[in-house]
Amino acid sequence: EEELQMIQPEKLLLVTVGKTATLHCTVTSLLPVGPVLWFRGVGPGRELIYNQKEGHFPRVTTVSDLTKRNNMDFSIRISSITPADVGTYYCVKFRKGSPENVEFKSGPGTEMALGAKPSAPVVLGPAARTTPEHTVSFTCESHGFSPRDITLKWFKNGNELSDFQTNVDPTGQSVAYSIRSTARVVLDPWDVRSQVICEVAHVTLQGDPLRGTANLSEAIRVPPTLEVTQQPMRVGNQVNVTCQVRKFYPQSLQLTWSENGNVCQRETASTLTENKDGTYNWTSWFLVNISDQRDDVVLTCQVKHDGQLAVSKRLALEVTVHQKDQSSDATP
């Protein structure tokens, strides 16, 4: 005859408020004859949690049909968990006796503790934009979780980052904990379309981590490159000069033309295009009237990008004598 074992496989069961907890208990023998009861705690003050045969336990259901002849599974489910339910639960075998049943063997117990899910991670980037090749810091925060053990990872475009520091508070015992992590990210010129992801894994999430994201587009400033060129062909007595502003981000841009130091107020044609990497190109055309012009016309294309100091490119206009002669003969 096999000696009865009471098997409670989980030492610790983490449950969240409002959910249902399943407490497992199996026996290895049908003998001796008698019921299996569930208690919370030990000793004379222990609380009866479930007795199949008698007592009112509206929150408790059995996993198996206890009336089946060879049933060896005495697992129970407790619904609508509250903080008052924490404690150690024991399944206990009784031997039928007179006048009272006699306790025969107890399981090792399962401690039920409250687990609280972490809040969705919130990722915050730097207050000001930074140019490529520089390092920026991102912070990630999540709150309200329990137990304290938690894993946080950082990713940039799916690649795990290693340069970060993480703190979990408080250090002592608490009902709930918070995590804060700061990651240092080196910006690349193509990072306009990049994302940083903060991933939090916790036992209450059952293998489905929470993620918070931030777009590097909020943190990066890609300064433009400027090129001013003169078109070889002229239109009547006008020469077309082009200012190409390339690979800048964000879109915020002011462009002004100056002719020999005098800012020109007249309208100019321009186009804005977006590159595959998320940066922008801006092309502005400026028509210079070359009739009666001296030879030393200097055009300046000045660009103020995202509130930064203005950058400019100059072009000394090349107007040949032949061009001047032609222009004086040309009809408007």
Partner: antibody, heavy 114, light 108 residues
């Protein structure tokens, strides 16, 4: 729906015996103890005993030992209470109660009278 | 056997009044095994409070239960006309199981 349907009014003579029935529906009778409770007119409640229909094992209050006999028939989901050597003291309403304590039968009124 | 003594045997209360019924056990009863029933004339008793302090389904929240060891109580925070009934405490901590003698609660 859980129900406990008890047998009707019984009027019996002193010294006789009577067998009251309680038929369960909406649950497996073997899953719970069945209790019997006595209530005399305008009086309190007295616990007579309980039976485990699964194996017939029963417990009685000392006062009802020898007076009451509980049995159960799982095939018909019925619990029985037999009362013997009836006297006027046995005149009362008898309730059957499921072991979870929230379901009671409607009661059987027993009158012992010559 | 454990004897449960309820007091008072009869009492009346005005609507809105706070009411406390007591149940005293001759020896210690585990709180898991102390129940209360409400009974109105012509009806079967209804489970009212289980495991000392848990309200059965449908019981108004003005009812509460407390106690431990040998001293238990049922409290109505604000008496209502429909609360007029008999209340019985019940222990199933040890055989033989026993009921208290009951408290008949009337409305003034």
């Amino acid at each position: 729906e859980v129900q406990l349907q008890q047998s009707g009014v019984e009027v019996v003579q002193p010294g006789a015996s009577v067998k009251l029935s309680c038929t369960a529906s909406g649950f497996n009778i073997e899953a719970y103890y069945m209790h019997w409770v006595k209530q005399r007119t305008e009086q309190g409640l007295e616990w007579i005993g309980r039976i485990d229909p699964e194996d017939g094992e029963s417990k009685y209050a000392p006062k009802f030992q020898g007076k009451a006999t509980m049995t159960a028939d799982t095939s018909s989901s019925t619990a029985y209470l037999q009362l013997s050597s009836l006297t006027s003291d046995d005149t009362a309403v008898y309730y059957c109660v499921r072991g979870s304590y929230e379901y009671w039968g409607q009661g059987t009124t027993l009158t012992v009278s010559s | 056997q454990i004897v449960l003594t309820q007091s008072p045997a009869i009492m009346s209360a005005s609507p809105g009044e706070k009411v406390t019924l007591t149940c005293s056990a001759s020896s210690s009863v585990s709180s898991s095994y102390l129940y209360w029933y409400q009974q109105k004339p012509g009806s079967s008793p209804k489970l009212w409070i289980y495991s000392t302090s848990n309200l059965a389904s449908g019981v108004p929240p003005r009812f509460s239960g407390s106690g431990s060891g040998t001293s238990y109580s049922l409290t109505i925070s604000s008496m209502q006309a429909e609360d007029a009934a008999s209340y019985f405490c019940y222990q199933w901590s040890s055989y033989p199981y026993t009921f208290g003698g009951g408290t008949k609660l009337e409305i003034k």
